[in-house]
């Protein structure tokens, strides 16, 4: 039950995180004009990964896409790549984790397969979260560097009559959304990995004992008794008839009402 809860919660947290990463990637406010000593501005600039926008005092907002690919800074391209990789990995992770959920039964999928899928999706979520955090952090670092450079420029060469005041940019809302979303995806991934440990079958090293009867040759392989004793309902007990010509599951694990959280 705790395993199902951990897995389910990991999935939900990752889902929210990936939705946040997608939202952050699409948002226009990665960097916003620094209003330092003037809280109200006639022209407010803000920029995203895909376009830059200007909001005028009337409320009119105009956005222009970055229609060049080669002319963009390498750092911006790197951030774009990291965010897209994060989204793709997260989306694949979500797809895998849906089939890995313990509360969803698909045919006669073994729990060991579900465990592997849970681990795979967990790792994907972790990498996805790290990509998002890395992307946002790279962009934030770029902003900090540019901020201090433009601040230095503002206070140099002011001897002349005409001043060219550079627009300084500071952290936009998308950065905080990205950091939080990346963190959630990472946490979700860790939870999936933890859930995987609980799902994985624990093999016991009992020696198989053969009982020879006069008429039939039936081999009993102990290990399935864990199911009845409650030590691990995931292990299958195989009875081998006629030299293993046909197998059937003796113990089926049905979800109990407590598994639905």
């Amino acid at each position: 039950m705790a395993v199902t809860a951990c897995q389910g919660l990991g999935f939900v947290v990752s889902l929210i995180g990936i939705a946040g990463i997608i939202a952050a990637t699409c948002m226009d406010q990665w960097s916003t004009q620094d209003l330092y000593n003037n809280p109200v501005t006639a022209v407010f600039n803000y920029q995203g990964l895909w376009r830059s926008c200007v909001r005028e005092s009337s409320g009119f907002t105009e956005c222009r896409g970055y229609f060049t690919l080669l002319g963009l800074p390498a750092m911006l391209q790197a951030v774009r790549a990291l965010m897209i990789v994060g989204i793709v990995l997260g989306a694949i992770g979500l797809l895998v984790s849906i089939f890995a959920l313990k509360c969803i039964r698909i045919g006669s999928m073994e729990d060991s397969a579900k465990a592997n899928m849970t681990l795979t999706s967990g790792i994907m979520f972790i990498v996805s979260g790290l990509c998002a955090i890395a992307g946002v952090s790279v962009f934030a670092n770029m902003l900090v560097t540019n901020f201090w450079m433009s601040t230095a420029n503002m206070y140099t060469g002011m001897g002349g009559m005409v001043q060219t005041v550079q627009t300084r940019y500071t952290f936009g809302a998308a950065l905080f959304v990205g950091w939080v979303a990346g963190g959630l995806t990472l946490i979700g991934g860790v939870m999936m990995c933890i859930a995987c440990r609980g799902l994985a079958p624990e093999e016991t090293n009992y020696k198989a004992v053969s009982y020879h009867a006069s008429g039939h040759s039936v081999a009993y392989k102990p290990g399935g008794f864990k199911a009845s004793t409650g030590f691990g309902s995931n292990t299958k007990n195989k009875k081998i008839y006629d030299g293993g010509a046909r197998t059937e599951d003796e113990v089926q694990s049905y979800p109990s009402k407590h598994d639905y959280v």
């Epitope: 501005t41 200007v54 005092s57 009337s58 409320g59 009119f60 001043q163 060219t164 627009t167």
Partner: antibody, heavy 120, light 113 residues
Framework: QVQLVQSGAEVKKPGASVKVSCKAS????????MLWVRQAPGQGLEWMGN????????YYALKFQGRVTMTVDRSTSTVYMELSSLRSEDTAVYYC?????????????WGQGTLVTVSS | DIVMTQSPYSLAVSLGERATINCKSS????????????LAWYQQKPGQPPKLLIY???TRESGVPDRFTGSGSGTDFTLTISSLQAEDVAVYYC?????????FGQGTKVEIK
């Protein structure tokens, strides 16, 4: 058509207050910022501040802060500008003007002006 | 505050001749975000409120005759009346529309020679 109609001329004594109104018609009143600009006799134009009729948010020029109050009455599509502690140098024609949407912060329509004379 | 300086103070031009008014700002009115200049030109005739002629330094307001042309970028701007008409006699103002507080030039009076 867009019209901004202002209240009539006022004569005030120094230290008094004046309240000028500006009634808008011909457009969606809450969609456009309203600005106040004054012009002393024979002088140039001076921006005093603006008001967002939708939120009622105001922004005043530093020179007038503490003395000017801009308010809005959405039910009558009217904005008001009140200037207190009047001095002789406040004698001017006061204009309300609309900030034209998508016009790079330019003022596309103006009221006819209200002459405020401050004299003892 | 951005200081707007217009020149000349007054201008006398013959009918049909070209009139040129200059406006210089103490700070750039160019916005890199959208590559636009935030400068407006107004015409004010005696006893009337100002009338918008040009916004964004070069875009003519609807209904304004095409003899009025705005040009310039950054800190230096020009309003040109290609062929002066009798009804163009007025005072012309440039306005900083980039930063609060909005500021105006002192005005240029255009008369007929």
């Amino acid at each position: 058509q867009v019209q901004l109609v202002q209240s009539g001329a006022e004569v005030k004594k120094p230290g008094a207050s004046v309240k000028v109104s500006c009634k808008a018609s011909g457009y969606t009143f809450t969609d456009y910022l309203m600005l106040w600009v004054r012009q002393a006799p024979g002088q140039g134009l001076e921006w005093m501040g603006n008001i967002n009729p939708y939120y009622g948010r105001t922004y005043y020029a530093l020179k007038f802060q503490g003395r000017v109050t801009m308010t809005v009455d959405r039910s009558t599509s009217t904005v008001y500008m009140e200037l207190s502690s009047l001095r002789s140098e406040d004698t001017a024609v006061y204009y309300c003007a609309r900030d034209g949407y998508s016009l790079r912060n330019a003022m596309d329509y103006w009221g006819q002006g209200t002459l405020v004379t401050v004299s003892s | 505050d951005i200081v707007m300086t217009q020149s000349p103070y007054s201008l006398a031009v013959s009918l049909g001749e070209r009139a040129t008014i200059n406006c210089k700002s103490s700070q750039s009115l160019f916005n890199s975000g959208n590559q636009k200049n935030y400068l407006a030109w107004y015409q004010q005739k005696p006893g009337q409120p100002p009338k918008l002629l040009i916004y964004g330094a070069s875009t003519r307001e609807s209904g304004v005759p095409d003899r009025f042309t705005g040009s310039g970028s950054g800190t230096d701007f020009t309003l040109t009346i290609s062929s002066l008409q009798a009804e163009d006699v007025a005072v012309y103002y440039c306005q900083n529309a980039h930063s609060y507080p909005y500021t105006f030039g002192q005005g240029t009076k255009v008369e007929i020679k």
